[in-house]
C-alpha cells in the first residue's frame, strides 16, 4: 500500500498503525495516501521537524501512550487537512508556541494526561475551527485570560484533573458555542460571579471534586440550556435561594458529598425535567415543607447518609412521580403519619440505619405500589396492626436488626410475617430482643407463650391474612427491586471510575461509591 514501514500495519482504508516498544522515532516512509495514523505505546521521546511532511492528506493523527516529552514547533507542518490530533498520555511538560500553526482544519485537539504546567493564549490562537479541546489530567495551576479567546467555535472543553486553584471570570467569555465544560477534580475554592455568563449554550457543567465552599447566587443565571450540573464532592455549606432558579432544562443535578446543612423551600426549581436528585453524604438535619415541590417529574431522591432527624409532614409535597426514596443512615426517630402520603407512585423506600422506635399505622397508607421497604437496623419493638396489609406488590421487606419485643403484642405481626415469609428474604430474619429469655430467637417461629405476657392484649388476634398476591412476582426468582436504581452513584460517561464496594451503613442503598459526581 504505497510502502508500509515494517513496524506498522497499513489497511486498504488508508489507516496506518505503528505500535511497539522497539519504535523510537516516527517510522518512514509513511504511505503518502494515509488518512489516519496512530503511533501508540512506543518509546518515541521527541518529534522533530516535519516528520509527517509527505502525508498531507492526513485527517486523524493519534500519538498516544508514548514517552514523548519534546516537540519541535514545526512537527505538524503541512498537515492542513488534519481534523483530529491526539497527543494524550505522553510526558509533555511544555508546548512550543506555534505548534498548531497551519492546522486550519483542526476540530479535535487532545492533550490530556500529560504533564503540562501552563498554557498561553498564543498556543491556540490559530485553531479557529477547534470544536473539542481536552486538557484534563495535566498540571495546570491557572488559565491566563485570553487562553481560549480565539476558539469561538469550541463546543467541548475539558480542564478536569488539573491543579487549578482559581478561575478568572473572563476566561470563558468568548465561548458562546460551548456545550460541555468540565472542571472536575481541581482545587477550586470559589467561582467568581459572571464566570459562566457567556456560556449561553452550555449543556453540561462538571465542577465535582473541587473545594468549592460557596456558590454565587447568580452563578448559573445565563445558562438556560444547562442539562447536567455536577457539584458533588465539594465543600458547599449552603445554597443561595435563587442559585438554581433559571435552569429549566436541568435533568441531572448531583450535590452529594458536600456540607449542606439545610435546604430551603423552593431551592430546586422549577426543574420540570429533573429525574434524579442525589443529596447523600451531606449534613442535612431537617426537611421543611415543600422543599422539593418544584420537582414534579423527580423519580429518584437520595437523602441517605445525612443527619436528618426531622421531616416536616409536607416535605415531599409535589413528588407525585417519585419511584425511589432513600432516607437510610440518618437520625430519624419518628415519622409523621402523612409524610409519604403524596408519594402515590413510590416503589422503593429505604429507611434502614435510622433510630426509628415506632411507625404510625398510616405511614404507608397512600403508597399502594410499594415493592420494597428497608427497615432493618432501627429500634423498632413492634409495628402497628395492618401496616402492610394494602401493599399487594410488596416483595421485599427487611426487618432484621431491630429490638423486637416478643410479648403477646407481637402476635399480629408474627402471624402476618408467617404468612408472608418470602417477602422477608432468606438471608437474615428478624429476631427477638426482649424479653431476655427469648432473645435471639426468630420472631417468625417464636413461641410467644414462653415470653412474658404483655399487659395489653390486642383485641384483633392477628393481622388480616395477606399471604401472596396473584400480581406479585414469585420470590426469590425476581431480582430484588431495591437493587436496581441505586446500586451506583450517578456516573458521568466521561470519567474513569474507581468503585469501592461498601456494605455497611456508609453505603448508599448498599451502593458502590463512585468517585465521580
Amino acid at each position: 500500500y504505497h510502502g508500509c514501514p515494517s513496524e506498522c500495519t497499513c489497511s486498504r482504508a488508508s489507516q496506518v498503525e505503528c505500535t511497539g516498544a522497539r519504535i523510537v522515532a516516527v517510522p518512514t516512509p509513511l504511505p503518502w495516501n494515509a488518512m489516519s495514523l496512530q503511533i501508540l505505546n512506543t518509546h518515541i521521546t521527541e518529534l522533530n521537524e516535519s516528520p509527517f511532511l509527505n502525508i498531507s492528506a492526513l485527517i486523524a493523527l493519534r500519538i498516544e501512550k508514548n514517552e514523548l516529552s519534546r516537540i519541535t514547533p514545526g512537527a505538524f507542518r503541512n498537515l492542513g487537512s488534519l481534523r483530529y490530533l491526539s497527543l494524550a498520555n505522553n510526558k509533555l511538560q511544555v508546548l512550543p508556541i506555534g505548534l498548531f500553526q497551519g492546522l486550519d482544519s483542526l476540530e479535535s485537539l487532545l492533550l490530556s494526561s500529560n504533564q503540562l504546567l501552563q498554557i498561553q493564549p498564543a498556543h491556540f490562537s490559530q485553531c479557529s475551527n477547534l470544536k473539542e479541546l481536552q486538557l484534563h489530567g495535566n498540571h495546570l495551576e491557572y488559565i491566563p485570560d485570553g487562553a481560549f479567546d480565539h476558539l469561538v467555535g469550541l463546543t467541548k472543553l475539558n480542564l478536569g484533573k488539573n491543579s487549578l486553584t482559581h478561575i478568572s471570570p473572563r476566561v470563558f467569555q468568548h465561548l458562546g458555542n460551548l456545550q460541555v465544560l468540565r472542571l472536575y477534580e481541581n482545587r477550586l475554592t470559589d467561582i467568581p460571579m459572571g464566570t459562566f455568563d457567556g456560556l449561553v449554550n452550555l449543556q453540561e457543567l462538571a465542577l465535582q471534586q473541587n473545594q468549592i465552599g460557596l456558590l454565587s447566587p447568580g452563578l448559573f443565571h445565563n445558562n438556560h440550556n444547562l442539562q447536567r450540573l455536577y457539584l458533588s464532592n465539594n465543600h458547599i455549606s449552603q445554597l443561595p435561594p435563587s442559585v438554581f432558579m433559571q435552569l429549566p432544562q436541568l435533568n441531572r443535578l448531583t450535590l452529594f458529598g458536600n456540607s449542606l446543612k439545610e435546604l430551603s423551600p423552593g431551592i430546586f426549581g422549577p426543574m420540570p425535567n429533573l429525574r434524579e436528585l442525589w443529596l447523600y453524604d451531606n449534613h442535612i438535619s431537617s426537611l421543611p415543607d415543600n422543599v422539593f415541590s418544584n420537582l414534579r417529574q423527580l423519580q429518584v431522591l437520595i437523602l441517605s447518609r445525612n443527619q436528618i432527624s426531622f421531616i416536616s409532614p409536607g416535605a415531599f409535597n409535589g413528588l407525585t412521580e417519585l419511584r425511589e426514596l432513600s432516607l437510610h443512615t440518618n437520625a430519624l426517630q419518628d415519622l409523621d403519619g402523612n409524610v409519604f402520603r403524596m408519594l402515590a407512585n413510590l416503589q422503593n423506600i429505604s429507611l434502614q440505619n435510622n433510630r426509628l422506635r415506632q411507625l404510625p399505622g398510616n405511614i404507608f397508607a397512600n403508597v399502594n405500589g410499594l415493592m420494597a421497604i428497608q427497615l432493618q437496623n432501627n429500634q423498632l419493638e413492634n409495628l402497628p396492626l395492618g401496616i402492610f396489609d394494602h401493599l399487594g406488590k410488596l416483595c421485599e421487606l427487611r426487618l432484621y436488626d431491630n429490638p423486637w419485643r416478643c410479648d403477646s403484642d407481637i402476635l399480629p405481626l408474627r402471624n402476618w410475617l408467617l404468612l408472608n415469609q418470602p417477602r422477608l428474604g432468606t438471608d437474615t430474619v428478624p429476631v427477638c430482643f426482649s424479653p431476655a429469655n427469648v432473645r435471639g430467637q426468630s420472631l417468625i417461629i417464636i413461641n410467644v407463650n414462653v415470653a412474658v405476657p404483655s399487659v395489653h392484649v390486642p383485641e384483633v388476634p392477628s393481622y388480616p391474612e395477606t399471604p401472596w398476591y396473584p400480581d406479585t412476582p414469585s420470590y426469590p426468582d425476581t431480582t430484588s427491586v431495591s437493587s436496581t436504581t441505586e446500586l451506583t452513584s450517578p456516573v458521568e460517561d466521561y470519567t474513569d471510575l474507581t468503585t469501592i464496594q461498601v456494605t455497611d451503613d456508609r453505603s448508599v442503598w448498599g451502593m458502590t461509591q463512585a468517585q465521580s459526581g
Epitope: R355, R357, R439, G440, D504, D505
Partner: antibody
Framework: EVQLVESGGGLVQPGGSLRLSCAVS????????VHWVRQATGKGLEWLGV???????NYNSALMSRLTISKENAKSSVYLQMNSLRAGDTAMYYC??????????????WGQGTTVTVSS | DIVMTQSPDSLAVSLGERATINCKSS????????????LAWYQQKPGQSPKLLIY???TRESGVPDRFSGSGSGTDFTLTISSLQAEDVAVYYC????????FGGGTKVEIK
C-alpha cells in the same frame, strides 16, 4: 458461660492499620450484637461502633472513615479494622454485648480488652 | 453528636454517706412516644472492664444493689449511691443512646 476475648493488640506504626478480633462463646453472633469501645489510659470511654445480629453496622461518626467492623458467624468472631492510625488511637480496646439487659444499646458483658500502642 | 458532660470530675464521700453524680446532655434524651430517656450509667473499677448499672435513666440492671438509683429526664440526670460502700470505689460514666452512643467524661468516686 458468656465470654468475649479480644486479641490482636500491640505496637503499630503511625499511619498503619490494625485488625482486632473478638472471639465470643456462650452465645451466637446471629442472635446478639457486639460493640467495640476503647479507652485511652486514664481517660474516658469512647464508643466505636456495633455490628448487629443480622450484620448491619453503626459507627462513631468521627471515626467512620477509618473503621470497619465485620464478623464471621461460623467462627464466632467479630473484627475491628482501623486504618491511618495515629498516636491518639493508643488505647485499650474492648468488645461488649447486650446479653440480658433490656437496653438495646446496653453493654452488660465485656471482654478484658486488648492494648494498642501507636508509636514509631 | 450529643455531648455528655459529667460533674463533678471526682468525689470523695465517707462510707455510708450519699454520693451524687450529675450528667447533662447537649440535647434531650427523652423520646416523647416511647416516653423513655435513653441514658445509662456504667461503673468501672480500677483494672476492670466497665459494668452496666442503670439504663433508661432509672431502670436498675439485674443484680445491681438497690443503693444505686438513677433519676432525671430530658437533659439532666443523676446517679445516686445512697450509702457508699468500699466496693463502690470506681469511675462512673453516663452514656446516651438516643443517637449513636457517647459517654460522659467520668466521675471518680473515692472514700473520704
Amino acid at each position: 458461660e458468656v465470654q468475649l476475648v479480644e486479641s490482636g493488640g500491640g505496637l503499630v506504626q503511625p499511619g498503619g492499620s490494625l485488625r482486632l478480633s473478638c472471639a465470643v462463646s456462650g452465645f451466637s453472633l446471629t442472635s446478639y450484637g457486639v460493640h467495640w469501645v476503647r479507652q485511652a489510659t486514664g481517660k474516658g470511654l469512647e464508643w466505636l461502633g456495633v455490628i448487629w445480629a443480622g450484620g448491619s453496622t453503626n459507627y462513631n461518626s468521627a471515626l467512620m472513615s477509618r473503621l470497619t467492623i465485620s464478623k464471621e458467624n461460623a467462627k464466632s468472631s467479630v473484627y475491628l479494622q482501623m486504618n491511618s492510625l495515629r498516636a491518639g488511637d493508643t488505647a485499650m480496646y474492648y468488645c461488649a454485648t447486650h446479653m440480658i439487659t433490656e437496653d438495646y444499646y446496653g453493654m452488660d458483658y465485656w471482654g478484658q480488652g486488648t492494648t494498642v500502642t501507636v508509636s514509631s | 453528636d450529643i455531648v455528655m458532660t459529667q460533674s463533678p470530675d471526682s468525689l470523695a464521700v465517707s462510707l455510708g454517706e450519699r454520693a451524687t453524680i450529675n450528667c447533662k446532655s447537649s440535647q434531650s434524651l427523652l423520646n416523647s412516644r416511647t416516653r423513655k430517656n435513653y441514658l445509662a450509667w456504667y461503673q468501672q473499677k480500677p483494672g476492670q472492664s466497665p459494668k452496666l448499672l442503670i439504663y433508661w435513666a432509672s431502670t436498675r440492671e439485674s443484680g445491681v444493689p438497690d443503693r444505686f438509683s438513677g433519676s432525671g429526664s430530658g437533659t439532666d440526670f443523676t446517679l445516686t449511691i445512697s450509702s457508699l460502700q468500699a466496693e463502690d470505689v470506681a469511675v462512673y460514666y453516663c452514656k446516651q443512646s438516643y443517637n449513636h452512643p457517647t459517654f460522659g467524661g467520668g466521675t471518680k468516686v473515692e472514700i473520704k
